[in-house]
């Protein structure tokens, strides 16, 4: 229903704490360079204004849209042009163009230093002094680095953070309590970020229909006992929630997500038998829990998919009468039978089925034409299954770091023009798929591997869009989202690439590497590996292994030496010479 004052409505629905958190996230995602204090001041002003509207919905400006209110606030920031350049031009536009303009200026790779975690004692001190400010800093720092982070989920992670600090700051050994727990939250939040970015990409590039198809497949896998009408309702609601968050309408998004969680918990009987545990939790935990609830048990008596979609004489008639509904029921029926497939694969199968009907229904004898469609699915299914087997075998043999290196070599050969930091980031993220998915039961591996890889490759595409350098990457990124991963997998060595000159300074290291944390050491070594491949794209695996083993030995020796600096300056040039010879 329409409300006299949108801002009062959202404040009442969400409550002050969530309202302030969401406004802070929204401002931090739009203006990524502003300090926490600048944003905190704006948030307080907006909150005070919302309270006046709650008291009197007819008060001045209370009837304005949230975009107008928030946009006016952002545009009133001093030195906007100096700090944000052409983003300031957005302020010359009217709504809704102004908001669209802000969205277009969101930066997926902002020039911000990595978010460093303070040491335990300092963290606990500032947390105890002012938990609200501490959490505000967390929301601000994550939101500005991840401008599409799913806002209600970020509130959930902040709540997790809060609980961990409350528990660990009371312990004697704060460090050993905090580190593993916060690392766990960080890992989950980073995965959540790339997954949500993928959803927003789907929405931005291919529209609501594409996202809704994704939602139908995903929900049908999770709730195979729900009927098609129920799945359609959930998919429609979920599409609305995501559209709002991707569009920067964070208050509406969080409010609608809470409504959806409420609906699911009130209708468990027609959705799934697995929801009760989630529904017993408070709001943020409930919505998070529902988003990753385990699959319900599949009905035992499902007929073969062929009955309605191949053998039925009415296929083309049903397709003609309501294409989207018919294809939606196909996607629903296929997905509920295959929780072991990735959503990407299910969407490729639905696309193949649609293309088959488009072709066959135009023929004089359609049933004879589409009769073999399910058999034609086989190669589409086998390809990702082989990918999972090959990659999980390799991961089990090499471990995470070795597996990342293998991927780094592979992807540097596919797209050597891409910047080394981007290749290293991508390979490290792609390599984590092993730890994340290969340890799962067989029937969960494929959906885990492929949907995670698709999300990581979406980030590769977003970064490449800013500075397109590789035709290979442009080709794979230009197609549909579900075809990207197979496209990248199919890429081979880029024959058009002119190898980089060998520069000794690229492979020159100093003693400061010895004191770096293990992760940073790995990144240094992987940077060198990518540069080696750019120098010799057709180097064999053996040659690269020889060089990397030599490099690791060199680091180990010099970092243990009494005079590290001398070791690096004398042994370094010898290492460079050996590398050149090994790759000659």
């Amino acid at each position: 229903e329409a409300h006299k004052s949108e801002i009062a409505h959202r404040y009442n629905d969400l409550g002050e704490q969530h309202f302030k958190g969401l406004v802070l996230i929204a401002f931090s995602q739009y203006l990524q360079k502003c300090s926490y204090d600048e944003h905190a001041k704006l948030v307080q002003e907006v909150t005070d204004f919302a309270k006046t509207c709650v008291a009197d919905e007819s008060a001045a400006n209370c009837d304005k849209s949230l975009h107008t209110l928030f946009g006016d606030k952002l545009c009133a920031i001093p030195n906007l042009r100096e700090n944000y350049g052409e983003l300031a031009d957005c302020c010359t536009k009217q709504e809704p163009e102004r908001n669209e303009c802000f969205l277009q200026h969101k930066d997926d790779n902002p020039s911000l230093p990595p978010f460093e975690r303070p040491e335990a004692e300092a963290m606990c001190t500032s947390f105890k002094e002012n938990p609200t400010t501490f959490m505000g800093h967390y929301l601000h720092e994550v939101a500005r680095r991840h401008p599409y982070f799913y806002a209600p989920e970020l509130l959930y992670y902040a709540e997790q953070y809060n609980e961990i600090l409350t528990q660990c700051c009371a312990e004697a050994d704060k460090e050993s309590c905090l580190t593993p727990k916060l690392d766990g939250v960080k890992e989950k939040a980073l995965v959540s970020s790339v997954r949500q970015r993928m959803k927003c990409s789907s929405m931005q590039k291919f529209g609501e229909r594409a996202f809704k198809a994704w939602a139908v497949a995903r929900l049908s896998q999770t709730f195979p006992n729900a009927d098609f009408a129920e799945i359609t309702k959930l998919a429609t609601d979920l599409t609305k929630v995501n559209k709002e968050c991707c569009h920067g309408d964070l208050l509406e998004c969080a409010d609608d997500r809470a409504e959806l969680a409420k609906y699911m918990c009130e209708n468990q009987a027609t959705i799934s038998s697995k929801l009760q545990t989630c529904c017993d939790k408070p709001l943020l935990k409930k919505a998070h829990c529902l988003s990753e609830v385990e699959h319900d048990t599949m009905p035992a008596d499902l007929p073969a998919i062929a009955a309605d979609f191949v053998e039925d004489q009415e296929v083309c008639k049903n397709y003609a009468e309501a294409k989207d509904v018919f294809l939606g029921t196909f996607l629903y029926e296929y997905s509920r039978r295959h929780p072991d497939y990735s959503v990407s694969l299910l969407l490729r199968l639905a696309k193949k089925y649609e293309a088959t009907l488009e072709k066959c229904c135009a023929e004089a004898n359609p049933p004879a034409c589409y009769g073999t469609v399910l058999a034609e699915f086989q190669p589409l299914v086998e390809e990702p299954k082989n990918l999972v087997k090959t990659n999980c075998d390799l991961y089990e043999k090499l471990g995470e770091y070795g597996f990342q290196n293998a991927i780094l070599v592979r992807y540097t050969q596919k797209a050597p023009q891409v910047s080394t930091p981007t290749l290293v980031e991508a390979a490290r993220n792609l390599g984590r798929v092993g730890t994340k998915c290969c340890t799962l039961p067989e029937d969960q591996r494929l959906p885990c591997v492929e949907d995670y890889l698709s999300a990581i490759l979406n980030r590769v595409c977003l970064l490449h869009e800013k500075t397109p350098v590789s035709e290979h990457v442009t080709k794979c990124c230009s197609g549909s989202l579900v075809e990207r991963r197979p496209c990248f997998s199919a890429l081979t060595v880029d024959e058009t690439y002119v190898p980089k000159e060998f520069k000794a300074e690229t492979f020159t290291f100093h003693s400061d590497i010895c004191t770096l944390p293990e992760k940073e050491k790995q990144i240094k070594k992987q940077t060198a590996l990518a540069e080696l491949v750019k120098h010799k794209p057709k180097a064999t695996a053996e040659q690269l292994k020889t060089v990397m083993d030599d490099f690791a030995q060199f680091l180990d020796t010099c970092c243990k030496a009494a005079d590290k600096d001398t070791c690096f300056s004398t042994e370094g040039p010898n290492l460079v010479t050996r590398c050149k010879d090994a790759l000659a």
């Epitope: 083309c316 009468e321 049933p367």
Partner: nanobody, 115 residues
Framework: EVQLLESGGGLVQPGGSLRLSCAAS????????MSWVRQAPGKGPEWVSS????????LYADSVAGRFTISRDNSKNTLYLQMNSLRPEDTAVYYC????????SSQGTLVTVSS
């Protein structure tokens, strides 16, 4: 909403001719193969003839081959069935369908062949 409206039926003497039409709406007509199906009193539906979306391919039941001709005009969203050398056993309700469907989703048009 898909709609199919047949016309052109009537009473005709054996050996005579009729031309049936089917006006289609509510879907992309040119993208679908179309068929004519008939149902004689007290009997089940019987497939008569089919044509591809472009009109380039046609198929006929043995019982009508050489006597009936299926055609279409995609600019008018209309399907036709030219019936020559009609026989008493051709008496039936004729209806057009989408694809290979045998079920009727329209009223059909009655063709009676009798002297």
């Amino acid at each position: 909403e898909v709609q199919l409206l047949e016309s052109g039926g009537g009473l005709v003497q054996p050996g005579g001719s009729l031309r049936l039409s089917c006006a289609a709406s509510g879907f992309t007509f040119r993208s679908f193969g179309m068929s004519w199906v008939r149902q004689a009193p007290g009997k089940g539906p019987e497939w008569v003839s089919s044509i591809s979306g472009s009109g380039s391919d046609t198929l006929y039941a043995d019982s009508v081959a050489g006597r009936f001709t299926i055609s279409r005009d995609n600019s008018k969203n209309t399907l036709y069935l030219q019936m020559n050398s009609l026989r008493p056993e051709d008496t039936a309700v004729y209806y057009c369908t989408i694809g290979g469907s045998l079920s009727r989703s329209s009223q059909g048009t009655l063709v009676t062949v009798s002297s």
